[in-house]
C-alpha cells in the first residue's frame, strides 16, 4: 500500500483506545499524536495491538523523545518494552523500583533478554549498589540473577541484601561467586543461633573456608550430602574423618555413594585408611597403615 501522510477525515485519535487496533500502520502514523500517546501510555498494555502496530507506536515515542523516554512513559510501556533495543534502554534513567518491576513483569517467564539485562544494569548503576529491595525484586523474577554477576559486581552487594537470597537463587553460582557471597552471608547471619544460622548459611557454604567447616562440625548441624558435595575441595581436604562425621551426622552414610566424586574422592585420598574404616562404610583409597604422610605444602612454606 502507498504511504499516506495525511490523516483521513474523522479518524484523528482523540484518545488511545481499542478502536486503534483496526488502523493500518500508515493510519496510526498519521492519526495518533505522539504527545497523546505519551500521556496515555498506561492504556496501551490493555489493548491487543499487533507487533506491527507497536512498531509504529514506538516510532512515535522515539520521535517525541530522541534523548530517551521519561520515567513516566517508561513505567507504562508494557508490551512495548519488548520492542526496545538495548541501545534505546541505555538512554533511559530508571530510578523507581516500581518501574523496574513493571517492565520485568512484561518479560516474566522468559529468559533474561539483552533488553532486561541492560535495564537492570542501568537501574543498579543508577542506585550505586545492589540494595535489598532491588535484589529481592530481581531474584523474584530471575532466580539465577545473582549467579549471572561477576565476582567484582557481587562485591557491591551489601550484607544486608543477603537476607533476600533464596537457596534456588544460588543454584548456578560457581565457587568464585560463592567465595564473594559467603563472607557477606556470614556477616548477615552472625547474630542467629546455631540451627537457624545453619539453615540460612547452608546454600552459601560453597564459599566457606576450612576453619568455618571445622566450627560447624562442632554444632551438630547434620549437613546433607548435596551441600557437602558443593563445598570447596581445598576447604574439605584438611578435615579429619571425625570432623566430617560430626559435620554430616546421620548423612555420613551417603559418602559411600559419592566416593568416586569430588570432593569426597580427593578427601578419601588424604585420610588414613584405618580412620576411614572407623566409619564402617567400606570406603577405600585412604593412606595405608604405616605410611608416613608428608605435608609438602607445609614443607614448601618452611623452605
Amino acid at each position: 500500500e502507498v504511504e499516506k501522510t495525511a490523516c483521513p477525515s474523522g479518524k484523528k485519535a482523540r484518545e488511545i483506545d481499542e478502536s486503534l487496533i483496526f488502523y493500518k500502520k500508515w493510519e496510526l502514523e498519521a492519526c495518533v499524536d505522539a504527545a497523546l500517546l505519551a500521556t496515555q501510555m498506561d492504556r496501551v498494555n490493555a489493548i491487543p495491538f499487533t507487533y506491527e502496530q507497536l512498531d509504529v507506536l514506538k516510532h512515535k515515542l522515539d520521535e517525541l523523545y530522541p534523548q530517551g523516554y521519561p520515567e513516566s512513559v517508561i513505567q507504562h510501556l508494557g508490551y512495548l518494552f519488548l520492542k526496545m533495543s538495548p541501545e534505546d534502554i541505555r538512554k533511559w534513567n530508571v530510578t523507581s523500583l516500581e518501574t523496574l518491576k513493571a517492565l520485568l513483569e512484561v518479560n516474566k517467564g522468559h529468559e533474561m533478554s539483552p533488553q532486561v539485562a541492560t535495564l537492570i544494569d542501568r537501574f543498579v548503576k543508577g542506585r550505586g549498589q545492589l540494595d535489598k529491595d532491588t535484589l529481592d525484586t530481581l531474584t523474584a523474577f530471575y532466580p539465577g540473577y545473582l549467579c549471572s554477576l561477576s565476582p567484582e559486581e557481587l562485591s557491591s552487594v551489601p550484607p544486608s541484601s543477603i537476607w533476600a537470597v533464596r537457596p534456588q537463587d544460588l543454584d548456578t553460582c560457581d565457587p568464585r561467586q560463592l567465595d564473594v557471597l559467603y563472607p557477606k552471608a556470614r556477616l548477615a547471619f552472625q547474630n542467629m543461633n546455631g540451627s537457624e544460622y545453619f539453615v540460612k548459611i547452608q546454600s552459601f557454604l560453597g564459599g566457606a573456608p576450612t576453619e568455618d567447616l571445622k566450627a560447624l562440625s562442632q554444632q551438630n548441624v547434620s549437613m546433607d550430602l548435596a551441600t557437602f558435595m558443593k563445598l570447596r575441595t581445598d576447604a574439605v581436604l584438611p578435615l579429619t574423618v571425625a570432623e566430617v562425621q560430626k559435620l554430616l551426622g546421620p548423612h555420613v552414610e551417603g559418602l559411600k555413594a559419592e566416593e568416586r566424586h569430588r570432593p569426597v574422592r580427593d578427601w578419601i585420598l588424604r585420610q588414613r585408611q584405618d580412620d576411614l574404616d572407623t566409619l564402617g562404610l567400606g570406603l577405600q583409597g585412604g593412606i595405608p597403615n604405616g605410611y608416613l604422610v608428608l605435608d609438602l605444602s607445609m614443607q614448601e612454606a618452611l623452605s
Partner: antibody, heavy 128, light 106 residues
Framework: QVQLVQSGAEVKKPGASVKVSCKAS????????IHWVRQAPGQCLEWMGW????????HYAQKFQGRVTMTRDTSISTAYMELSRLRSDDTAVYYC?????????????????????WGQGTTVTVSS | SYELTQPASVSVSPGQTASITCSGD??????ASWYQQKPGQSPVLVIY???KRPSGIPERFSGSNSGNTATLTISGTQAMDEADYYC?????????FGCGTKLTVL
C-alpha cells in the same frame, strides 16, 4: 443455535432515554464484538457503534458521540445500548449484530468479518 | 467521513443475472460485505470479505471488489431474491453502510 434476542418495543417521550438489551446464546459471548445498527422507517441502515464484550472497549459513530452508551454484562451474556436525549427522528428499529475481529493477512492490523448474526430488532418510538 | 454509493433500484428477470454495485473511494483497499433484507425482517449476511459466502447462502450469490467498486452478483435470480441489498465496508474501526438497492425480480 446461535442467536441474539433483543428486548421488546419501547415508546418514549422526547428528551428521555431508552436502553435496549441484546442477549447472546449458542456461542462464546466474549469472542465476538457486538455492533448496534438502526433503521428509521423506510430508511437506510445506520451504524451506531460497537462494544467488545471481552474488554468492554467501545467505539461510537461520530453522529452519536455523547448520546450513546454501550455496555455489557458478561455474566448473563448480554449487551446494552442506551440512547439519551431522544428526539422524534430517533424513531427506528434498533438491531444488535455480532462480528468477529480477525488479524489481516500480514498480521498488521485487525479487521471485522461480516455481521453474521443479527437480533430480531427492537422498535423504539419517540413521540410526545 | 467515508461514504458508499449504491443505485436505488435494480430490476432483473427471473433466471437472469443481477449485478448490484457499490462505490467508494479506494473501496478495493477495504473489505466489503453485502446484506439482504426482506420487508419486516432483520438483515442477513450474504457476502463477507469481498467474495466469501457464509454457510447456508446459495452459490448463486457472489461478490468482487477492486478499485473503487464492489459488486454483488446474483446469477439465475429467483423471485425469492427480491429484497433490499446493502453494501457495507469497514473503514478502520468504523462501519459504513450504503443506502441500499431495491432488487426487483420482474
Amino acid at each position: 443455535q446461535v442467536q441474539l434476542v433483543q428486548s421488546g418495543a419501547e415508546v418514549k417521550k422526547p428528551g428521555a432515554s431508552v436502553k435496549v438489551s441484546c442477549k447472546a446464546s449458542g456461542y462464546t459471548f466474549t469472542g465476538y464484538y457486538i455492533h448496534w445498527v438502526r433503521q428509521a422507517p423506510g430508511q437506510c441502515l445506520e451504524w451506531m457503534g460497537w462494544i467488545n464484550p471481552k474488554s468492554g472497549g467501545t467505539h461510537y459513530a461520530q453522529k452519536f458521540q455523547g448520546r450513546v452508551t454501550m455496555t455489557r454484562d458478561t455474566s448473563i451474556s448480554t449487551a446494552y445500548m442506551e440512547l439519551s436525549r431522544l428526539r422524534s427522528d430517533d424513531t427506528a428499529v434498533y438491531y444488535c449484530a455480532r462480528a468477529e475481529a480477525r488479524l489481516a493477512a500480514r498480521q498488521e492490523y485487525y479487521y471485522f468479518y461480516g455481521m453474521d448474526v443479527w437480533g430480531q430488532g427492537t422498535t423504539v418510538t419517540v413521540s410526545s | 467521513s467515508y461514504e458508499l454509493t449504491q443505485p436505488a433500484s435494480v430490476s432483473v428477470s427471473p433466471g437472469q443475472t443481477a449485478s448490484i454495485t457499490c462505490s467508494g473511494d479506494k473501496l478495493g483497499d477495504k473489505y466489503a460485505s453485502w446484506y439482504q433484507q426482506k420487508p419486516g425482517q432483520s438483515p442477513v449476511l450474504v457476502i463477507y470479505q469481498d467474495s466469501k459466502r457464509p454457510s447456508g447462502i446459495p452459490e448463486r450469490f457472489s461478490g468482487s471488489n477492486s478499485g473503487n467498486t464492489a459488486t454483488l452478483t446474483i446469477s439465475g435470480t429467483q423471485a425469492m431474491d427480491e429484497a433490499d441489498y446493502y453494501c457495507q465496508a469497514w473503514d478502520s474501526s468504523t462501519v459504513v453502510f450504503g443506502c441500499g438497492t431495491k432488487l426487483t425480480v420482474l
